[in-house]
Each structure stands twice: as structure tokens, then as C-alpha cells.
């Protein structure tokens, strides 16, 4: 039976890398079989030499070399952009047009946005070599070379972020010549070589001067979570402080912070975090639902100045960001026991006030929910008839119920003499396993 054309396989965006030809695929159905023709930026391709395009019998377009295009700096498009290809499939009943596929060519420009600079660092302190790679398509990756060889990155000591190399603790062996290399499918570019010298810490003569520094911690503000960090980021605060005293002898500032304990209790130890700022900075990695104390300390090399005043901030509670763990269902005498383990501590997001337990519909229990208050991690539910019992559990903070656990099910047989909880070595059933068994 005759039918109009339909595109089955659309052409895909591609990078022309050469030296071999680029291929654009297009497949269509239809009766009579449709004829395929290709368009570039809406204009039909001639396919006649010197046109670099060639059509294969199956409708695939071969591009032997990149098509000619305007001056790269016409301001209308990047030189990467070779155009948009579409295919048309036609028979006597009509024409189908594919989605457009962009053909681009790999490019790596020569000019670095930021070149690494020569620097002197102190043993034990952190230092950063900045690098902003040239514009490239595809976007280039950055690697670092030291003394002519690729730098072996040590987790916890080296971090490459946004092109820059952060060295957590300088060692004498870090001395040398560093180079940032930007690479993509068009090739690679090398930055200038930056000389890094590492000095032993000085016996500072400024500590007396540093002791005269006064720091006023002015405010601590809870930052709005960055949507890019996902739905459940850890909270971060913005610290702002003022420095008075001698002319800026401090080389760096450290935040000291701890959770507040009950009045009269032994204070928690202060955690320390080096701040990336001289008057204000962000401090992350905190926990929701905690009361924190914050202060700031100036330092210069190994010398420390006096701590600032202490400011308090209560971080609001959030709902728990993980479900209770190890949820199990066990049969009892005319009852079913539900037990669980609290979510991991880092996911509490406040004080767990209790738990919510739901029974799921379409089982022997009608849909219902129970609230378990306090630290109790089990619940006994009365059962009146054989059949399947499925529950979910969620932890509750002052902000509400968090993420529920996966449904866990138990199948009670006729006389409730024994409960089927197959396969036994795998613990309770999931809803999926239960459905599969009931189907069998």
C-alpha cells in the first residue's frame, strides 16, 4: 500500500575532524521508496564537482572536505560553524523534512585568557597557579605539566578547578617550571612557563605586629543555595569582617566554627577552614538545623593573630535528604513488625523528631499512615487477613517528612503459619519482586 515518506533516522550534529570524510545519515520509509535530497542552510546541494558532497545510494551524505564559508570574523558566526544540513525524502504522496544537523569544525585559538605567573610559595601553605585556556570548540580541557612532564595529580593535595591548579600544601619538591596545556580535537596549546620557587617558612619578625591586629566579625549570612549544586546542597554562609591595626600584616584569614552545645556543656572543638578573601568570604560544608559559632583568625606564615569576636547563627532545619535504612517487615502473632535504621547522620538536616510509616494501597492493608515519635525505630501493625503488606518509612524533622524508603513488602500465607519473604537471602521483598511473584 502506498504511503507518504517518514524520516526514520535523522542526521546528527557532527564535528568535522578529517582527514577522512564526514558522514550525515538520513533514512526514510514510504511507498514508493522516497528519493533523498540534502540541503545546506536551506539551499539544495548540487552534488556536482567541485561540490565536495557525495550522495550514497542509502541516502547517506559524504562530505569530503569542509564546505567553503565566509570570513571567520564576520561577526555573525564563529569559524567553527560550517552550516546546518537537512534531508528531504520525497515520493508522489509528499515530502518529509528531517531535523537540522549542525556541522562544525574543531578550533583551538592561540591566546590564553590567563597565563600562569611566576610565584614564590611557602612550605606548608597553599598556592594557586591560574590558567584560562584559549577559546576552543569543543571546549578545551586543561592539564598541567611540571618540568616538561605531565604533573601527577595527588588527590587531596592537587586540585584543578576552572583551569587553575590549587596546591593544598606546598613542599620543597613542588619547586619547578609549570605549564598549562589546553587540548581539544583541533590540537593543543601551551601556556608560558611559570617558575615556582618554594621557601622555608620564615621566623617572622611580625608576630608582635600581628598581635596588634584587631578583627571585628561583622556579620554571618546564610547564602542562597546555587541551583547548579543540585536539589540538596549543604548550607554555606558568607562571613564579613573588618581589620584594624597595623597596615595589613596578615597574609591569610581562617574561619573557626563549631556547633553550639547546651549551656554549661563542654564546647565542641573548633573546626578550621582557610578563607579565600581579605574582608569577606564563603564558608561551606555546614549542616542544616544546627546552631553555629563563628570567628575569624588572621595569620602570616606560621604566626597567628588574635581571634575575632564570636557570632552565632542558627541554620534552619530541612527535611532529611535520605530515607531510613534497612527497612524490614517481620510477621508476628496477628501483627507485622516494621523496623528500620535512621538515615546517615549527614542527611538528618536537623533533629529527627520521629518517623512516618505508610502502608501502600492495593495490598491487604488499606492505605494508611502512622507516626512514630521520638527515637523509636520500630512499629507493630495489626493484621487481620492473609495477603501482601507493603510499607514505606520516612524520617521527620521540624521541617517535615523527608525522602521515603523504597517500598518493602511481606506476603502472609493462608493460615499465617509462615510468611513468605523470598528470596530469603536477600531480605524483604521489594514491590517489584512481589509483583513478579504474584504474576507467577
Amino acid at each position: 500500500q502506498d504511503s507518504p515518506p517518514q524520516i526514520l533516522v535523522h542526521p546528527q550534529d557532527q564535528l568535522f575532524q578529517g582527514p577522512g570524510p564526514a558522514r550525515m545519515s538520513c533514512q526514510a520509509s514510504g511507498q514508493p521508496p522516497p528519493t533523498i535530497r540534502w540541503l545546506l542552510n536551506g539551499q539544495p546541494l548540487s552534488m556536482v564537482p567541485p561540490d565536495p558532497h557525495h550522495l550514497l545510494p542509502d541516502g547517506t551524505l559524504l562530505l569530503l572536505q569542509p564546505p567553503a564559508r565566509g570570513h571567520a570574523h564576520d561577526g555573525q558566526a564563529l569559524s567553527t560553524d560550517l552550516g546546518v544540513y537537512t534531508c528531504e525524502a520525497s515520493n508522489r504522496l509528499g515530502t518529509a523534512v528531517s531535523r537540522g544537523a549542525r556541522l562544525s569544525v574543531a578550533v583551538l585559538r592561540e591566546d590564553f585568557q590567563i597565563q600562569p605567573r611566576d610565584m614564590v610559595a611557602v612550605v606548608g601553605e597553599q598556592f594557586t597557579l591560574e590558567c584560562g585556556p584559549p577559546w576552543g570548540h569543543p571546549e578545551p580541557t586543561v592539564s598541567w605539566w611540571k618540568d616538561g612532564k605531565p604533573l601527577a595529580l595527588q588527590p587531596g593535595r592537587h586540585t584543578v578547578s576552572g583551569g587553575s591548579l590549587l596546591m593544598a600544601r606546598a613542599e620543597k619538591s613542588d619547586e619547578g617550571t609549570y605549564m598549562c596545556v589546553a587540548t581539544n580535537s583541533a590540537g593543543h596549546r601551551e601556556s608560558r612557563a611559570a617558575r615556582v620557587s618554594i621557601q622555608e617558612p620564615q621566623d617572622y619578625t611580625e608576630p608582635v605586629e600581628l598581635l596588634a591586629v584587631r578583627i571585628q566579625l561583622e556579620n554571618v549570612t546564610l547564602l542562597n543555595p546555587d541551583p547548579a549544586e543540585g536539589p540538596k546542597p549543604r548550607p554555606a554562609v558568607w562571613l564579613s569582617w573588618k581589620v584594624s591595626g597595623p597596615a595589613a600584616p596578615a597574609q591569610s584569614y581562617t574561619a573557626l566554627f563549631r556547633t553550639q552545645t547546651a549551656p554549661g556543656g563542654q564546647g565542641a572543638p573548633w573546626a578550621e577552614e582557610l578563607l579565600a578573601g581579605w574582608q569577606s568570604a564563603e564558608l561551606g560544608g555546614l549542616h542544616w538545623g544546627q546552631d553555629y559559632e563563628f570567628k575569624v583568625r588572621p595569620s602570616s606564615g606560621r604566626a597567628r593573630g588574635p581571634d575575632s569576636n564570636v557570632l552565632l547563627l542558627r541554620l534552619p532545619e530541612k527535611v532529611p535528604s535520605a530515607p531510613p535504612q534497612e527497612v524490614t517487615l517481620k510477621p508476628g502473632n496477628g501483627t507485622v513488625f516494621v523496623s528500620w535504621v535512621p538515615p546517615p547522620a549527614e542527611n538528618h538536616n536537623g533533629i529527627i523528631r520521629g518517623y512516618q510509616v505508610w502502608s501502600l494501597g492495593n495490598t491487604s492493608l488499606p492505605p494508611a499512615n502512622w507516626t512514630v515519635v521520638g527515637e523509636q525505630t520500630q512499629l507493630e501493625i495489626a493484621t487481620h487477613m492473609p495477603g501482601s503488606y507493603c510499607v514505606q518509612v520516612a524520617a521527620v524533622t521540624g521541617a517535615g517528612a523527608g525522602e521515603p524508603s523504597r517500598p518493602v513488602c511481606l506476603l502472609l500465607e493462608q493460615a499465617m503459619e509462615r510468611a513468605t519473604q523470598e528470596p530469603s537471602e536477600h531480605g524483604p521483598w521489594t514491590l517489584e519482586q512481589l509483583r513478579a511473584t504474584l504474576k507467577r
Partner: antibody
Framework: EVQLVESGGGLVQPGGSLRLSCAAS????????MSWVRQAPGKRLEWVAT????????YYPDSVKGRFTISRDNAKNTLYLQMNSLRAEDTAVYYC???????????WGQGTLVTVSS | DIVMTQSPLSLPVTLGEPASISCRSS???????????LNWYLQKPGQSPQLLIY???NRFSGVPDRFSGSGSGTDFTLKISRVEAEDVGVYYC?????????FGPGTKVDIK
Amino acid sequence: EVQLVESGGGLVQPGGSLRLSCAASGFTFSTYAMSWVRQAPGKRLEWVATISQGGTYTYYPDSVKGRFTISRDNAKNTLYLQMNSLRAEDTAVYYCARLIYYDYLDYWGQGTLVTVSS
Amino acid sequence: DIVMTQSPLSLPVTLGEPASISCRSSQSLENENKNLYLNWYLQKPGQSPQLLIYRVSNRFSGVPDRFSGSGSGTDFTLKISRVEAEDVGVYYCLQVTHVPWTFGPGTKVDIK
């Protein structure tokens, strides 16, 4: 036709936060680096931030480093500027602009006004 | 940071006459690869800036040929061969050779 439309400006108190958006259309957003530029009333233009086309590389002047974050969502053809710890001197019209390589800003949006005042 | 200065800061012009604006940088805008990244923009009253000249001397598409740019190192010039009424506004130079990118203070061009 290249179009850039900023939104999200408004009045905010010192120390507050604001998030600007820039909706792009008429070009393949994911192959262009993008920038934010601002202009305080009666003042010269000031470059605020730049982001590479894939979002890996970001650049800021010292005046906003640590307070402002530029980001992008290529699936939504949208550029963002998250501004924290705002100060009175951040009051300005904020423009988003398209970059050709890192050579020049060719198209600019109409701007959105941010006022930081108590 | 590189400081950009412009002169004059105000330029009253006569229609049909030529005009010239100077832009100076506190250090050379030539990078390691001998490339120069200096651009000129016009901001008409109540509008966003628009690109006129990129990389010292390249006219952006749609910009009339009465506009031309020249210069090297630290000294750059924008010339208008015959000023027209639509050319009024503030002209800015911008260097993007070195981060942070910096603008000149602007030159206000109006009709005498």
C-alpha cells in the same frame, strides 16, 4: 536574529542576594562564550564576568570575585548571574552580551536594573 | 589592572565634519602572540552598547564605512570621516587582551 533578554533585576537590601537571568535566542547558544557587563548611573561600563561556552571556565574582576557567580544552562539557552553580599556600589544596569571567541562582545541585551539600597 | 583613558571626554561636532577619539592603555595591549584585542562601542541615548570596531581596525557587519579604527601598543584611535546625526552618543573603548577586561571612561559626542 540574535536576541538576549535579561531579567531578575530589582531592589535589594545591602548584604542581600539576587539572581539575574539572560534568555538567548537566534543562535547556537552552546558554542558561544558569554559575559555580564554593568553600568552604574552616570558611570563607565564595567566588565563583571565571563563564562566559556561549556561553562568550565569562568573569569571575574576582583571587585566581584567571591560574591558573584556566572553560570549557564545550555539546554535552556540561559545565562545566569548569582549575586550575593550585595553592596550599594553594585547598583547598576546589568547587561548580558555574546562573545565571539574571547575577542569581542558583539550583541548585548537591553539590560536589567539592580538597585542595592536600605 | 590595565587602565584605559580616552580623550576628549566630550566632543561637540558639526554634521558632515570628521571626528576623532583617542584611547590609551596604561600598558601595551599586545600579548605574547603579538595579537591586539581593542574594541570600540557606541552607546546611543537610552540604548545598549553596540559594537563598531573589533580587534583595533575591523569594522563589524552593518557598521557604516565612515567609521575606522587604528593604533598599536598603547595608542588607539577611532575616526568618523563625516559625522551624521545618528552618530551621537557615548563612545567606549574596551581592551580584552588582559583579564580583567577594562573599558575607557567614554567620550560623549553631540552635535554643535
